[in-house]
């Protein structure tokens, strides 16, 4: 089962629209790429709950991408 | 409230097609990637197949690849499976199932999904 076939993207759907920050062990941001045209907000749950994509349009989301995006640049 | 309701099941022989359909209600296909599993006596529950009715992406365990084709109808709410050339060892209950924010990584992880039917029958016979 070929996982990361080119032209794929991590997730699959439009995502959930918003997690319980209580929730988050932390989030990670993919930007578009060769391999994705979208971006991708993933959410790694506590308690080895395992991940979820966050819709990327939701309000959630954007909070999260704008404060990634402070703590980087 | 969110249910899923499998039905098409049944016996046929070996060779023979079967269209399974689920029957979403209490969401829209659209905001969830939809899954079917299978398990057999005695054996751990397994993907199948999946689709994301947002983009019309699909999905296939190797052992069904170009034999089963997955679908779905956006105003019925349905999601089908039309399985062809049917061996013995495809004996199972079939189940679907709906994820929501759902990972390439966890695609056949059954505790990824939020929501299950209660199963449909599908027999096998040589």
């Known amino acids: 089962f070929p996982m990361f076939k080119r032209g794929r993207c991590l997730c699959i759907g439009p995502g959930v629209k918003a997690v319980k920050v209580a929730d988050i062990e932390k989030a990670s941001i993919m930007y578009p790429s060769n391999n994705c045209d979208k971006i991708e907000v993933i959410i790694t749950l506590k308690e080895n709950k395992g991940q979820r994509c966050l819709n990327p349009k939701s309000k959630q989301a954007r909070l999260i991408i704008k404060k990634v995006e402070r703590k980087n640049f | 409230e969110v249910q899923l309701v499998e039905s098409g099941g049944g016996l046929v022989q070996a060779g023979g097609s079967l269209r399974l359909s689920c029957a979403a209600s209490?969401?829209?296909?659209?905001?969830?990637?939809i899954g079917w599993f299978r398990q057999a006596p005695g054996k751990e529950r397994e993907g199948v197949s999946l689709i994301s009715s947002d983009d019309g992406s699909t999905y296939y365990a190797d052992s069904v690849k170009g034999r089963f084709t997955i679908s779905s109808d956006n105003a019925k709410n349905t999601v089908y499976l039309q399985m062809n050339s049917l061996k013995p060892e495809d004996t199972a209950v079939y189940y679907c199932?709906?994820?929501?924010?759902?990972?390439?990584?966890?695609?056949?992880?059954?505790?990824?999904?939020?929501?299950w039917g209660q199963g449909t029958q599908v027999t096998v016979s040589s």
């Open positions: 199932a709906a994820a929501q924010g759902l990972l390439l990584l966890s695609l056949w992880v059954p505790t990824q999904y939020d929501y």
């Open positions: 209490g969401f829209t296909l659209n905001d969830y990637a």
